[in-house]
């Protein structure tokens, strides 16, 4: 997170960290005892998953391995459409006052709306710091009308853009698959922006969770 | 200042195999932030894209290279390398090692544009 | 693959004028595209990135544009240093990364 502020301790039960081994891979977002919700372009082979902590690292958090994950079978690498994936856990999660499930949405949050966005991805750029607590930035929703200003034909119909105006507060290496909550429910998933991160004006583009909760219901029961 | 640094013999006999090292000096290879490239120019034509590797040693080679082409890198001695096998005369060219800087991140970090290159290393092939 | 067509592959041009060089992709590429200058015995230089940001420490005269298909470079004026070799290279996934075939800036 760049220009970010550390996160409220235990204020985001639902994050988890999703690790190569030791190593920051991708963030996550705790969607039911078994399931993880992330980004698509986060896929591996399999997962050691952090719940729990606002410590990346933290030995006294929760770690629990995660050998099967599902894609979404519109995912494209070239476009990076319905980047979105669901991760079953090899067991179920401890629920406390620590770890909690995120609220899925019931509806699409409007443009303007405030939301908080959260991860242990890099403060800055280019060059690469990680930080060992949770960070957090306060952003806005903004119009798809406004953000294809930006980018254009990158933008899909299920991409959400949020910043702010003429700040650098936004997502970065790392944040990847990280909730973007908005009036406490889940609305997106940290999916790309542009590089260096930071640039004025040029929003953080999120996976529009309101557009995938029949996917992720089906994909969970599917799976039990 | 980054800087690249291409080293290897400059004359490679027929169906031997071509080896070249790429020296990173003013930073370090072991940024998750890059991808590290091996470019080739065959005499009075065009730029051939070789093949990529991340810090992750995850490589990423060209189609019609890929049966014959090895990159990796090593980070303890911040250099990375290129080994084509079964080399011909058509592979006589300048060999470019650089550096990807992704134009994007997330989703969007493969793609790139090759931001520092070595100076270039010439490689003939022949007997 | 993608394939890179650039146009014209030589133009002759006088120091002052306004040179585009044109570059088309077989597919689209959103504005996943590059443009690089290499003067002879050098290693290229990379110009424009995301088709029309301009690389730190590259003067003004060079600007891109295009998205999708259809993209170009321009030197608003030219300059004694600006002739030279000029490649597009798009980078839409992996593999293949490709470049164009090249246009060659040669003195009027």
């Known amino acids: 997170i760049i220009d970010g502020y550390k996160c409220k301790e235990g204020s985001h039960p639902w994050q988890v960290a999703l690790l190569k081994g030791n190593q920051l891979h991708c963030g996550g977002v705790l969607v039911d005892k078994y399931w993880v919700l992330t980004a698509a372009h986060c896929k591996m082979g399999q997962y050691q998953v952090q719940l729990g902590s606002d410590k990346i690292g933290d030995q006294s958090a929760q770690k629990i391995k995660a050998t099967k994950s599902f894609r979404h079978p519109g995912y494209s690498t070239k476009t990076h459409v319905n980047d979105i994936m669901l991760v079953r856990l090899d067991e179920p999660v401890k629920m406390s006052s620590k770890v909690e499930a995120v609220q899925l949405p019931e509806h699409c949050e409007p443009p303007g709306t405030s939301c908080t966005v959260s991860g242990w991805g890099t403060t800055t750029s280019p060059d690469v710091t990680f930080p060992s607590d949770l960070m957090c930035s306060d952003v806005k929703l903004i119009s798809s009308r406004e953000c294809k200003k930006v980018y254009k034909d990158l933008l899909g119909k299920t991409m959400l853009c949020a910043g702010i105006p003429d700040s650098k507060t936004n997502t970065c290496n790392g944040d990847s698959g990280g909730p973007l909550v908005c009036n406490d429910t889940l609305q997106g998933l940290v999916s790309w922006g542009t590089y260096p991160c930071g640039q004025p004006n040029d929003p953080g583009v999120y996976t529009q969770v309101c557009k995938y909760k029949r996917w992720v219901m089906e994909t969970m029961k599917t799976h039990r | 200042q980054l800087q690249l640094q291409e080293s290897g013999p400059g004359l490679v006999k027929p169906s031997e195999t071509l080896s070249l090292t790429c020296t990173v000096s003013g930073g370090s290879i072991s940024s998750d932030d890059y991808y590290w490239v091996w470019i080739r120019q065959p005499p009075g034509k065009g730029l051939e894209w070789i093949g990529s590797i991340d810090y992750y040693a995850s490589t990423y080679y060209s189609p019609s290279l890929k049966s014959r082409v090895t990159i990796s890198v090593d980070t303890s001695k911040n250099q990375f390398s290129l080994k084509l096998s079964s080399v011909t005369a058509a592979d006589t060219a300048v060999y470019y090692c650089a550096r990807g800087r992704p134009l994007g991140y997330g989703a969007k970090h493969y793609y790139y544009g090759m931001d520092v290159w070595g100076q270039g290393t010439t490689v003939t092939v022949s007997s | 693959d993608i394939q890179m067509t650039q146009s014209p592959s030589s133009l002759s041009a006088s120091v002052g004028d306004r040179v585009t060089i044109t570059c088309r992709a077989s597919q689209s590429i959103s504005s996943y595209l590059n443009w690089y200058q290499q003067k002879p015995g050098k290693a290229p230089k990379l110009l424009i990135y995301?088709?029309?940001s301009l690389q730190s420490g590259v003067p003004s005269r060079f600007s891109g544009s295009g998205s999708g298909t259809d993209f170009t470079l321009t030197i608003s004026s030219l300059q004694p240093e600006d002739f030279a070799t000029y490649y597009c290279q798009q980078s839409p996934y992996f593999p293949p990364l490709t470049f164009g075939g090249g246009t060659k800036v040669e003195i009027k």
């Open positions: 995301s088709a029309s």
